[in-house]
């Protein structure tokens, strides 16, 4: 079948990195600069992806493979093949259309991306708060009072005072 196909279609003999040039009697011509063909038998080469601005080049384009981009520091990749770059925030913040904003009281974010999430409610598991939460860290739940040995006491630190200027977004 392969032999039959190549007799019928000379383009099938063109390897990756070339294209079947109709203007030159279907001769296999190398892909022009800034273009590539990743499979054989192609009638055109694809334009290389350009990594500029918010994108930077992770892998250069070659005649047989497209360029690969990642994001300039300060931003991180989103989507398949890093199709978008999204701004980093500090821990204790989340990204909004107004830029990076501090987590509201009672929420935290321990990463440079993603949203602020509510602190764990220790009492739902019958436990007490061992370490208070912050904008950057979740609370740490301790053992429930019932788990404590007789005579021991559970010291629950007071809840932190509401910080000024951290009204809900």
């Amino acid at each position: 079948f392969e032999r039959t196909r190549s007799l019928q279609d000379p383009c099938s003999n063109c390897p990756a990195g070339t294209f079947c040039d109709n203007n030159r009697n279907q001769i296999c011509s190398p892909c022009p600069p800034n273009s590539f063909s990743s499979a054989g038998g192609q009638r055109t080469c694809d334009i290389c992806r350009q990594c500029k601005g918010v994108f930077r080049t992770r892998k250069e384009c070659s005649s047989t493979s497209n360029a690969e981009c990642d994001c300039t520091p300060g931003f991180h990749c989103l989507g398949a093949g890093c199709s978008m770059c999204e701004q980093d925030c500090k821990q204790g913040q989340e990204l909004t259309k107004k830029g990076c904003k501090d987590c509201c009281f009672g929420t935290f974010n321990d990463q440079k991306r993603g949203i602020c999430r509510p602190w764990t409610n220790c009492s739902l598991d019958g436990k007490s708060v061992l370490v208070n939460g912050t904008k950057e860290r979740d609370v740490v739940c301790g053992p429930s009072p019932a788990d404590l040995s007789p005579g021991a006491s559970s010291v629950t630190p007071p809840a932190p005072a509401r910080e000024p200027g951290h009204s809900p977004q």
Epitope: G53, G79, S83, M84
Partner: nanobody, 123 residues
């Protein structure tokens, strides 16, 4: 081909003004949120401002509030950044960038940006 081309950068004295422009081609500007971001020498990329499709929403990083104004002319497929009261710390390469499909709903990712225009603030 989808393209953004910035212009208008240059050397300006502290306290001076500049207006950056960004010409969009290959897509309809009025369908997208648009952004300006900048990269100071030796620093990471910093988001500066954004504007929604019809220009009714505009947001700025704290350090430029009251000094920079983002605007757009959808009929001319152009985005602008008016910069006044410029400071040495505004020295950077400025890029315009398109908010990707779903910007402001699912994410705040930028999917297209230009080559940038250089702004130098120095006496």
């Amino acid at each position: 081909e989808v393209q953004l081309v910035e212009s208008g950068g240059g050397l300006v004295q502290p306290g001076g003004s500049l207006r950056l422009s960004c010409a969009a081609s290959g897509f309809t500007l009025s369908n997208y949120w648009m952004n300006w971001v900048r990269q100071a020498p030796g620093k990471g990329l910093e988001w500066v401002a954004n504007i929604n499709q019809d220009g009714s929403e505009r947001y700025y990083v704290d350090s430029v509030k009251g000094r920079f104004t983002i605007s757009r002319d959808n009929a001319k497929n152009s985005l602008y950044l008016q910069m006044s009261s410029l400071r040495a710390e505004d020295t950077a390469v400025y890029f315009c960038a398109r908010g990707g499909e779903g910007y402001g709903v699912d994410h705040y990712g930028l999917d297209v940006s230009g080559q940038g225009t250089t702004v130098t603030v120095s006496s």
